[in-house]
């Protein structure tokens, strides 16, 4: 997250981290039920660990943390790497969470966000695009949903209904390491960090997010059948 601020501890209890090896964060994720996470489909890896209830970027133990393995990764069938359409994936964890003030699911928005809606994006991604600077703790950033027209003008030929753009003034954006993390609007999960230009946080190059309102049925059906 570029030019965000430290999230309040436990204010994003649905925020997850996907880890390679013992503790290398490579993507964010979102808890949507006691045993299921959402993340970006481009975050798919054969072996990874899941960390919930953690505030710090470092692997130091925190009392609220819970660690899991992913036992099933189900990318949306319409996703084709390295494209950006349908960029979401369900992950089933090896067990259910212990519900606590640090770990809680978030409800997915059934209605699509409208232009001007204020939202919160969060993650442990780099705070500077051209240098890999990482925050000490989870970062939060208020962003505004942009019109479809403005989104398409920013990225001609790259935007479809499975995406929405959101941003703020130049200098504020999600960035590398934030992929798969939550965009929460009015208390409901509206999007996942998906893509954007390089470097992050350029004028007229907003972040692009998976438009989850388009996938509510697929998410419910997939969870029910697995």
């Amino acid at each position: 997250i570029v030019n965000g601020s430290d999230c309040q501890k436990d204010a994003q209890p649905w925020q997850g981290a996907l880890l390679l090896g013992p503790n290398k964060l490579y993507c964010g994720a979102v808890l949507i039920s006691p045993q299921w996470l959402l993340t970006a489909a481009h975050c798919r890896k054969p072996v990874f660990r899941i960390r919930l209830g953690h505030h710090s970027m470092s692997p130091v133990y925190e009392s609220g943390q819970q660690m899991f393995q992913g036992i099933k990764s189900i990318p949306h069938p319409g996703y084709s790497h390295p494209g950006h359409s349908n960029d979401l994936m369900l992950i089933k964890m090896n067990r259910k969470i212990r519900d606590s003030h640090s770990v809680k699911p978030v409800e997915i928005a059934c209605d699509c966000a409208t232009e001007g809606t204020r939202c919160m994006v969060s993650g442990w991604g780099t705070t500077s695009s051209s240098h890999n600077n990482f925050p000490k703790v989870l970062q939060c950033l208020n962003i505004t949903v942009l019109s479809e027209e403005r989104c398409k003008n920013s990225y001609p030929g790259q935007i479809d209904k499975t995406m929405f753009c959101a941003g703020d003034e130049e200098g504020r954006d999600s960035c590398q390491g934030d992929s798969g993390g939550p965009v929460v609007c009015n208390g409901k999960l509206q999007g996942l960090v998906s893509w954007g230009d390089f470097p992050c946080a350029q004028r007229n190059r907003p972040g692009v997010y998976t438009n989850l309102c388009e996938f509510v049925k697929w998410i419910k059906d997939t969870m029910n059948s697995n």
Epitope: C27, T126, N132, G157, Q158, S179, G207
Partner: antibody, heavy 124, light 107 residues
Framework: QLQLQESGPGLVKPSETLSLTCTVS??????????WSWIRQPPGKGLEWIGN???????YYNPSLKSRVTISVDTSKNQFSLKLSSVTAADTAVYYC????????????????WGQGTTVTVSS | EIVLTQSPGTLSLSPGERATLSCRAS???????LAWYQQKPGQAPRLLIY???SRATGIPDRFSGSGSGTDFTLTISRLEPEDFAVYYC????????FGGGTKVEIK
């Protein structure tokens, strides 16, 4: 299948500007999934990254070459170009163009498609 | 700039043997940002491994990568005749740099 082809003069005089073009076929340059790179390799030596150009035309250069390098893109021709000014004999090398992939994960996908390279000699 | 030092400079082995190539960084590099390439004479480099341990498309499973921090390794479990080449590591954690290369030659 995506292919990259470098082209440009094989001989450049010292103090002049080296200009090379990379033509992309079998795919489109304006893609928000990819960036485009230049790399060079002096005779008998290792590889040196020169710079990248991204979807919007934003660039990222090797700090040691930054003052002399310009990478640009011509989407209408599906080409991207390298200009290296004030060349010396030390710039004699095989120059490669390549493609990389980027997203907002914290992950490096490598340079997965390369041109075959073009030799540039700097000599009077 | 992060300097990558590869060793040995040359590795003389016979087909069927195991090759272990080392890449050491002058400062810590995220393993997610390390790649390995193979280059044969007169050809462009070919991506073998990305993210320190993930094989690129079409790369046989005799090639494997490992490591973290400042020490990374490329292993070829059983050398085939077509594996004799020069191998380069690359980091993209900060301004991208390549190692000096390791030549794997037939003994």
């Amino acid at each position: 299948q995506l292919q990259l082809q470098e082209s440009g003069p094989g001989l450049v005089k010292p103090s002049e500007t080296l200009s090379l073009t990379c033509t992309v076929s079998g795919g489109s340059i304006p893609s928000s999934s990819y960036y485009w790179s230049w790399i060079r390799q002096p005779p008998g030596k290792g590889l040196e990254w020169i710079g990248n150009i991204y979807y919007s035309g934003s660039t990222y250069y090797n700090p040691s070459l930054k003052s002399r390098v310009t990478i640009s893109v011509d989407t209408s021709k599906n080409q991207f170009s390298l200009k290296l000014s004030s060349v010396t004999a030390a710039d004699t090398a095989v120059y490669y163009c390549a493609r990389g992939e980027y997203d907002r994960s914290y992950y490096y996908w490598g340079l997965d498609v390369w041109g075959q390279g073009t030799t540039v000699t700097v000599s009077s | 700039e992060i300097v990558l030092t590869q060793s040995p400079g040359t590795l003389s082995l016979s087909p069927g043997e195991r090759a272990t190539l080392s890449c050491r960084a002058s400062q810590s590099v995220s393993s997610s940002y390390l790649a390995w390439y193979q280059q044969k004479p007169g050809q462009a480099p070919r991506l073998l491994i990305y993210g320190a341990s993930s094989r690129a498309t079409g790369i046989p499973d005799r090639f494997s990568g490992s490591g973290s921090g400042t020490d990374f390794t490329l292993t070829i479990s059983r050398l085939e005749p077509e594996d004799f080449a020069v191998y380069y590591c690359q980091q993209a954690f900060s301004s991208p740099t390549f190692g000096g290369g390791t030549k794997v030659e037939i003994k």
